[in-house]
C-alpha cells in the first residue's frame, strides 16, 4: 500500500513539475526591465527564450521573435537546449511511469517489469528536473554577472551618436517557475526510485524449518518439493509475486548443494 502511494505521489508530483517546466520554457518573463521613463512613453521590456516583448504605458504590447535576430548568444542556445531536453525526458518518463503504476493492470505484466519501468521513469524525472534547474540557473547567472547590463558608454559613428542605455535586468517569473518545477520533477523522480525498491522482487532469508525424521530417512516437504535432510535446509527462498499473498511453504525453493538427487 505504501509502495503504491509513494509511486502514485511521485507520478503526480513529477506531472506537476513537468507541466511547470513546459510553462517556464514558453513564458516570456525570463528577464524583466523598466527601460526608463522615455519622454514619449514609459517602456517595460521583458524577454524570454524565444522572443522579446515591449509593453508601453498605454497598454500596447508588441513581441518580436528572436528568429529575426542574428548571432544569438551561445548561453541562450544552451538554456533552450537544456529546457527542451528536460521536457522530452520528462514526457517520456511520464509515458513510461503510467504503464509502471502498480494500480494499473496491463495484461500479465510482472512486478519485476513494473519495478524496472518505475526505476527508469524515476531516473528520467531526476535528469529532467536537473536539466530544468541547470537551464534556469545558467540564465539567472547571466543576469547576476551583468551579462544583460549594458555599460553606459557613447561612441560616434557614421549615423551619429550612439548611447547605450543603462539597463539592469531582473529575474522574471519564469525563473522561479522553472526552479520550483525542476525541484518538483526531481522530488517526483526520487519518489519513483524509492517506490521501485518496494516493487522489486528481492531475496529474503527465512528461518529454516527442519523436518527431522528418525534415522537417516529423508523428510518431504508438502507440495511435491525436493526432499532435503534436516542438516542442509535451503534457507534462501525466492519471493515470487503474482499479486496475491503466499505462505512460506508455497514459495518455490531452489536446489542447494546439499540437496539429494
Amino acid at each position: 500500500m505504501a509502495v503504491t502511494a509513494c509511486q502514485g505521489l511521485g507520478f503526480v508530483v513529477s506531472l506537476i513539475g513537468i507541466a511547470g517546466i513546459i510553462a517556464a520554457t514558453c513564458m516570456d518573463q525570463w528577464s524583466t526591465q523598466d527601460l526608463y521613463n522615455n519622454p514619449v512613453t514609459a517602456v517595460f521590456n521583458y524577454q524570454g527564450l524565444w522572443r522579446s516583448c515591449v509593453r508601453e504605458s498605454s497598454g500596447f504590447t508588441e513581441c518580436r521573435g528572436y528568429f529575426t535576430l542574428l548571432g544569438l548568444p551561445a548561453m541562450l542556445q544552451a538554456v533552450r537546449a537544456l529546457m527542451i531536453v528536460g521536457i522530452v525526458l520528462g514526457a517520456i518518463g511520464l509515458l513510461v511511469s503510467i504503464f509502471a503504476l502498480k494500480c494499473i493492470r496491463i495484461g500479465s505484466m510482472e512486478d519485476s517489469a513494473k519495478a524496472n519501468m518505475t526505476l527508469t521513469s524515476g531516473i528520467m524525472f531526476i535528469v529532467s528536473g536537473l536539466c530544468a534547474i541547470a537551464g534556469v540557473s545558467v540564465f539567472a547567472n547571466m543576469l547576476v554577472t551583468n551579462f544583460w547590463m549594458s555599460t553606459a558608454n557613447m561612441y560616434t559613428g557614421m549615423g551619429g551618436m550612439v548611447q547605450t542605455v543603462q539597463t539592469r535586468y531582473t529575474f522574471g517569473a519564469a525563473l522561479f517557475v522553472g526552479w520550483v518545477a525542476g525541484g518538483l520533477t526531481l522530488i517526483g523522480g526520487v519518489m519513483m526510485c524509492i517506490a521501485c525498491r518496494g516493487l522489486a522482487p528481492e531475496e529474503t532469508n527465512y528461518k529454516a524449518v527442519s523436518y527431522h525424521a528418525s534415522g537417516h530417512s529423508v523428510a518431504y516437504k508438502p507440495g511435491g518439493f525436493k526432499a532435503s535432510t534436516g542438516f542442509g535446509s535451503n534457507t534462501k527462498n525466492k519471493k515470487i509475486y503474482d499479486g496475491g499473498a503466499r505462505t512460506e511453504d508455497e514459495v518455490q525453493s531452489y536446489p542447494s548443494k546439499h540437496d539429494y538427487v
Partner: nanobody, 119 residues
Framework: QVQLVESGGGSVQPGGSLRLSCAAS????????MGWYRQAPGKQRELVAG???????NYGDSVKGRFTISRDNAKNTVYLQMNSLKPEDTAVYYC??????????????WGQGTLVTVS
C-alpha cells in the same frame, strides 16, 4: 551598429513648411520609440515630438498644433511634418531612436542632425 539617416532640413520663410525624415538601419531588432529633438544655439536640447511603436505620441509645448509626427514601422522611418514655421523654430533637429538591438541590449541612437533655418 545602428545608423540613422536624416533628411529634409533647409531654409524656409516664416509660415512655411518642411518635412523631415529619419531612416534607421543596421542591427535593429525592435525599435521602441522614434522621435525628434532640437537644439537652438546656446540652448538645451528639447523634445519636439516622439512616437512609440504602439502609436503613443508626445509633442513639445511650443510645437503643438503645428508639427505632426508619423512613423512607418515597416521601413523603420519617422517623419516630422512642420507647418506654420516661426523664426524661433530655427535649430538643429536630431532624430532619436530607442532600440532593442538584441537580447538584453538597448541603445539610444542619435542622428547627426539636420539644420532647419526659418528667416
Amino acid at each position: 551598429q545602428v545608423q540613422l539617416v536624416e533628411s529634409g532640413g533647409g531654409s524656409v520663410q516664416p509660415g512655411g513648411s518642411l518635412r523631415l525624415s529619419c531612416a534607421a538601419s543596421g542591427s535593429i531588432f525592435h525599435i521602441v520609440v522614434m522621435g525628434w529633438y532640437r537644439q537652438a544655439p546656446g540652448k538645451q536640447r528639447e523634445l519636439v515630438a516622439g512616437m512609440s511603436t504602439g502609436g503613443t505620441t508626445n509633442y513639445g509645448d511650443s510645437v503643438k498644433g503645428r508639427f505632426t509626427i508619423s512613423r512607418d514601422n515597416a521601413k523603420n522611418t519617422v517623419y516630422l511634418q512642420m507647418n506654420s514655421l516661426k523664426p524661433e523654430d530655427t535649430a538643429v533637429y536630431y532624430c532619436n531612436v530607442l532600440v532593442i538591438s538584441g537580447i538584453g541590449s538597448h541603445l539610444e541612437v542619435w542622428g547627426q542632425g539636420t539644420l532647419v533655418t526659418v528667416s
